[in-house]
């Protein structure tokens, strides 16, 4: 069951506030509050910002990275921090906002000829066509002159949604993050009722596609809060 997976199978070496409910792709019930949503803290305001403890960059939103909140602070206490914009200092690619990568300690723009996650060596895989894509996270690795032009197809390992092809987002799937399809009209989605509430979502869903929003399905209005079904609906 979902609970047994959460409580006993996925063992997180993380601080206490983790282990919220997880949304199954295609499940009949929307996930409970307290779930990491693609994009993470970027929808929060300063007023209601709640630090989200983490152990690795993948546990943070697409515009965040995992680090100690204070310079030279306790290495054991790490939270998701807002990504660094262009020309800001960095130590690894994940610290830089989407569209940028870390070069010589500074976040610089990823132009067409550069992949933000230039990595130690070529890690490509064939998709049975003439194109290939990065297979592996682009974080905590050294620079090289290798270049990548193509985006990850469905199922490819990713770090951020910008690593994935159009119509896909980067979402957690057990111990990896992979490119998954952006949700279509009528598909079950994950609605987060409380801004700033996070939990580690084992099967992260993508967000709803363009022109759609995640809303309670009309015939589920009478249901209890915990069992309301959310689907992607036209604005």
């Amino acid at each position: 069951t979902l609970n047994s997976v959460l409580n006993s199978n996925a063992i997180k070496n993380l601080p206490p506030p983790l282990g919220g409910a997880a949304g199954h792709p295609g499940s009949a019930v929307s996930a409970a509050p307290g779930i990491l949503y693609p994009g993470g803290n970027k929808y929060q305001t300063i007023d209601n910002y709640q630090p989200y403890p983490c152990a690795e960059d993948e546990e943070c939103g697409t515009d965040e990275y995992c680090a100690s909140p204070t310079r030279g602070g306790d290495a054991g206490v790490q939270i998701c921090l807002a990504c660094r914009k262009r020309r800001k200092r960095c130590m690894r690619h994940a610290m830089c906002c989407p569209g940028n990568y870390c070069k010589n300690g500074i976040c610089v723009s990823s132009d067409q000829n550069h992949f933000r996650g230039e990595i130690e060596e070529t890690i490509t895989e064939s998709f049975g066509n003439d194109h290939s894509t990065l297979d592996g996270y682009s974080r905590r690795t050294t620079l090289s002159s290798k270049m990548y032009h193509t985006k990850g197809q469905e199922g490819s390992v990713c770090l951020r949604s910008s690593d994935c092809a159009s119509g896909l987002c980067c979402a957690r799937h057990f111990w990896s993050k992979i490119c998954k399809p952006v949700l279509k009209e009528g598909q079950v989605c994950t609605k987060h009722r409380r801004k700033g509430s996070h939990g580690l979502e084992i099967f992260q869903r993508c967000y709803c596609g363009e022109g759609l929003s995640c809303r309670i399905q009309k015939d589920h209005h009478q249901a209890s809060n915990s069992s309301r079904l959310h689907t992607c609906q036209r604005h």
């Epitope: 997976v5 199978n9 996925a10 063992i11 997180k12 070496n13 993380l14 792709p25 295609g26 152990a55 690795e56 960059d57 993948e58 546990e59 990595i119 130690e120 060596e121 890690i123 895989e125 049975g128 297979d135 592996g136 996270y137 682009s138 974080r139 905590r140 690795t141 469905e154 199922g155 490819s156 390992v157 799937h173 057990f174 111990w175 990896s176 992979i178």
Partner: antibody, heavy 118, light 107 residues
Framework: EVQLLESGGGLVQPGGSLRLSCAAS????????MGWVRQAPGKGLEWVSA????????YYADSVKSRFTISRDNSKNTLYLQMNSLRAEDTAVYYC???????????WGQGTLVTVSS | DIQMTQSPSSLSASVGDRVTITCRAS??????LNWYQQKPGKAPKLLIY???SLQSGVPSRFSGSGSGTDFTLTISSLQPEDFATYYC?????????FGGGTKVEIK
């Protein structure tokens, strides 16, 4: 070229312990989740455990939970499987494997045989 | 747990034959289905991931199809080196589970 080399297998008595190692080379180790899969003699494949790239997230099959511990040392490019309270049914060839697209295991080691017998 | 049922469990075929192996999941697994080939005394080798994507270096005579619960591995023209055991695997839910295997033997 991706290479995964397991070691640490052998004969052990029921209730005993073993630690398997998997030395990885030819790819950026920290960027990949890794896993262990086993195969009992003459039988099919059974997933045992997996660990995220950073090592912060681990998963286990129910049959080994609380007895086996997966870990990794990214500074040494090495994956481990600590096996305690071994049982006869744990006898198998243990493979270490790299987790790729769709969480498929896209590269495998040659395997190391673990025999649990009195 | 999600059960993966492969059929047939074994088959005999000749070089040049078209071979089809099926795999059925006990519940929908979308396209989270992978196929492996294993020869005696050797480690498994990934052939197909995501139901239909050919792994790098795998000959194009291998193809995969399906979505949901029913999947197929096809070898369009069997070659001598293809005689082996084939396994399907789902990665939609933990525990990850494999099919029982299909042994392809020489007729």
């Amino acid at each position: 070229e991706v290479q995964l080399l397991e070691s640490g297998g052998g004969l052990v008595q029921p209730g005993g312990s073993l630690r398997l190692s998997c030395a990885a080379s030819g790819f950026a180790f920290t960027t990949y989740a890794m896993g262990w899969v086993r195969q009992a003699p003459g039988k099919g494949l059974e997933w045992v455990s997996a660990i995220s790239g950073s090592g912060s997230t681990t998963y286990y099959a129910d049959s080994v939970k609380s007895r086996f511990t997966i870990s990794r040392d990214n500074s040494k490019n090495t994956l481990y499987l600590q096996m305690n309270s071994l049982r006869a049914e744990d006898t198998a060839v243990y493979y270490c494997a790299r987790s790729g697209s769709f969480l498929s295991f896209d590269s495998w080691g040659q395997g190391t045989l673990v025999t649990v017998s009195s | 747990d999600i059960q993966m049922t492969q059929s047939p469990s074994s088959l005999s075929a000749s070089v040049g034959d078209r071979v089809t192996i099926t795999c059925r999941a006990s519940q929908s697994i979308s396209r989270h289905l992978n196929w492996y080939q294993q020869k005696p005394g050797k480690a498994p080798k990934l052939l197909i991931y995501g139901a239909s994507s050919l792994q790098s270096g795998v000959p194009s005579r291998f193809s995969g199809s399906g979505s949901g619960t029913d999947f197929t591995l096809t070898i369009s023209s069997l070659q001598p080196e293809d005689f082996a055991t084939y396994y399907c695997q789902q990665t939609y839910r933990t525990p990850l589970t494999f099919g029982g295997g299909t042994k392809v033997e020489i007729k």
